[in-house]
Structures are given as structure tokens and as C-alpha cells.
């Protein structure tokens, strides 16, 4: 059931980590992996990583994408390797934005 409480020994997954929160590591371990895209001062900011606390991931992953932010979540080792979050579009792109990977 979706709202079931996590088991005491929740499984941990290895995830790709890209972004400021990763320090000098390119992977992390958590209960869910994510890939996110947000618009910050006109830049597309791409990040990847782990939700290390079950409730945190549950909340964020259920949030529907908005014009300024999208998060895609998955469970499985390295499952966010080939996921790139997409902002919702209504047949048009957002003017004045640039792509930017936070490394």
C-alpha cells in the first residue's frame, strides 16, 4: 500500500549524485533516487541524488511538476542514471532560460 509505514530495515539504493549537495562524491545511498530540474535566476539547474529519509522522499516525489520545478524519483540501484527530469510544457519553451548543471 502506498501510504504504508517503511520497514525498520528499509532497503538502501545506490544513486548517481550530481549537484552542490554531493560534495566531492558522485554517488550516494538512500531510500530513493531522484533527478530534478528547477529554474533558478533564468538557469535550468539539473541535480541528481538520494532522498535519505523515507518521509522526505515520499513528500517530494508526490509533488506534481510545476513550471519552475520537476522531480522524478525511482527505487533501484543507479535508477537515476538515465533519468532527466522535464519541466511541463504547453507546446512552448520558457524564454530567457539556459541549461546549467550544478556540479
Amino acid at each position: 500500500v502506498e501510504d504504508e509505514k517503511p520497514k525498520v530495515n528499509q532497503k538502501l539504493y545506490m544513486c548517481v549524485c550530481e549537484g552542490l549537495s554531493c560534495g566531492n562524491e558522485d554517488h550516494c545511498e538512500g531510500q530513493q533516487c531522484f533527478s530534478s530540474l528547477s529554474i533558478n535566476d533564468g538557469f535550468h539547474v539539473y541535480q541528481k541524488g538520494c532522498f535519505q529519509v523515507y518521509e522526505q522522499g515520499k513528500m517530494t516525489c508526490k509533488t506534481p511538476p510545476s513550471p519552475g520545478q520537476a522531480v522524478e524519483c525511482c527505487q533501484g540501484d543507479w535508477c537515476n542514471r538515465n533519468i532527466t527530469a522535464q519541466l511541463p510544457t504547453k507546446g512552448k519553451s520558457f524564454p530567457g532560460t539556459q541549461n546549467f548543471h550544478l556540479e
Epitope: L12, D26, H27, E29, Q31, D77, W78
Partner: antibody, heavy 119, light 112 residues
Framework: QVKLLQSGAALVKPGDSIRMSCKAS????????IHWVKQSHGKSLEWIGY????????NYNEKFKSKATLTVDKSSSTAYMEFCRLTSEDSAIYYC????????????WGQGVMVTVSS | DVVMTQTPVSLPVSLGGQASISCRSS???????????LHWYLQKPGQSPQLLIY???NRFSGVPDRFSGSGSGTDFTLKLSRVEPEDLGDYYC?????????FGSGTKLEIK
């Protein structure tokens, strides 16, 4: 089954360099981080660093930063460690180790490479 | 660096008896993800170390239930019940919560 097969023992001169190999089999090489560990004679274990075979990303123990270089060859599922400017302090057994998933720590170890530095 | 203090250095035991090894860390081993990355290894004479217990108390596959791990924060224990000849060797704790990873100095389990 998972195996990490390391290169053979080596006798090297002070000041020389050595490159040892660790050939992985029995699993998808790019899915597991490879760490390297040093064991000096009759002593405990020291962590040298790790390499992510998928990305090539590395992280080193500060103590070994100017001594060790970790690389991989994905096509042959082989990890390498080069040790440079060898001294007698570098005489030891060196292990390559697979870091397991689900927080299991180092789940599989190579058989070790005995390196002797002597003139 | 996190210092792992392992005691005793040597532990003479009788076959069929019990053994207890302690490992203390100089700082908490609770990771930001809530997990505690403290593991135990056995190195038999002439062999590579092998994983016994991961994340404090989880037995690795194939490890008999004579081995058990416990503890939290900075204080951890490995217990062996009904010691058998193949249990003899050097035991090491390892923390992988903080970089650099650090090992305990080892405990030699030997026959009394």
C-alpha cells in the same frame, strides 16, 4: 560468482612505480564502486581510496593522494592502481575490494598483491 | 579522521566458548541518511578479509548465526557464541560513514 582477480606479487626498487590490476568477473563491473586497501606486514588495514567504474570518479585518502592513482578499463572490467615513488613504507599487501549495495560494506575482496620494495 | 579503537588486541578463547570484541569510534557513526555504517570482518590466516556483519547487526550471506553485532552511536560489539576452529583469525571493524574510511587495529582470536 563474483571474483576479483589481482595481479601477481612484485619486487620493486625504491623510487620506482608499480601498476597493479584487479579484474572483476561475475557481475556488472560498472554497477559497483571499487575500493583499494593497504595492509602492512602484521598490521591493520588502511583505506587508500575508491573509483566509480561507471563515471571514473575517484576519492582518495589524503594520506595517499600523492602516492596512488586509480583508473579503470571498462572494456576489460579491470581496475588499476598505480603507486609511485615507492619506499620501504610501501611494502605491503594491497587489496581491491567491491563495495556492496544496500549498505553492505566491502562484500568481496581480491586475493591481494604483495609488494616488496627493496634495493 | 575517525579513530576506531578496538579491544582487546588478543582474545584467547576455548572452543565452544564465547567471545566479545569491542569497537569504539571517536565520533558518531550515524550517517545523514540515518544509517550506521559499521562493519565487521574476519581475516583468517593467509587469506583476504571477509565480511561478517554489515551496518552494525546484519549478517552477510552465508555467515552463521554464531556471529552477532550490536551497538549504536560510537560503541559497538561483535559477539561469537560456540567458537569453532574456523573462527580463529584477526577481526577488524570498519566505519564507512565518514571519509576517509577507517579500520580498527584488529583483534586476534586464538585458542586458549
Amino acid at each position: 560468482q563474483v571474483k576479483l582477480l589481482q595481479s601477481g606479487a612484485a619486487l620493486v626498487k625504491p623510487g620506482d612505480s608499480i601498476r597493479m590490476s584487479c579484474k572483476a568477473s561475475g557481475y556488472t563491473f560498472t554497477d559497483y564502486i571499487i575500493h583499494w586497501v593497504k595492509q602492512s606486514h602484521g598490521k591493520s588495514l588502511e583505506w587508500i581510496g575508491y573509483i566509480n567504474p561507471y563515471s571514473g570518479g575517484t576519492n582518495y585518502n589524503e594520506k595517499f593522494k600523492s602516492k596512488a592513482t586509480l583508473t579503470v578499463d571498462k572494456s576489460s572490467s579491470t581496475a588499476y592502481m598505480e603507486f609511485c615513488r615507492l619506499t620501504s613504507e610501501d611494502s605491503a599487501i594491497y587489496y581491491c575490494v567491491r563495495r556492496g549495495h544496500d549498505g553492505t560494506g566491502f562484500d568481496y575482496w581480491g586475493q591481494g598483491v604483495m609488494v616488496t620494495v627493496s634495493s | 579522521d575517525v579513530v576506531m579503537t578496538q579491544t582487546p588486541v588478543s582474545l584467547p578463547v576455548s572452543l565452544g566458548g564465547q567471545a566479545s570484541i569491542s569497537c569504539r569510534s571517536s565520533q558518531s557513526l550515524v550517517h545523514s541518511n540515518g544509517e550506521t555504517y559499521l562493519h565487521w570482518y574476519l581475516q583468517k590466516p593467509g587469506q583476504s578479509p571477509q565480511l561478517l556483519i554489515y551496518r552494525v547487526s546484519n549478517r552477510f550471506s552465508g555467515v552463521p548465526d554464531r556471529f552477532s553485532g550490536s551497538g549504536s552511536g560510537t560503541d559497538f560489539t561483535l559477539k561469537l557464541s560456540r567458537v569453532e576452529p574456523e573462527d580463529l583469525g584477526d577481526y577488524y571493524c570498519l566505519q564507512s560513514t565518514h571519509l576517509p574510511l577507517t579500520f580498527g587495529s584488529g583483534t586476534k582470536l586464538e585458542i586458549k
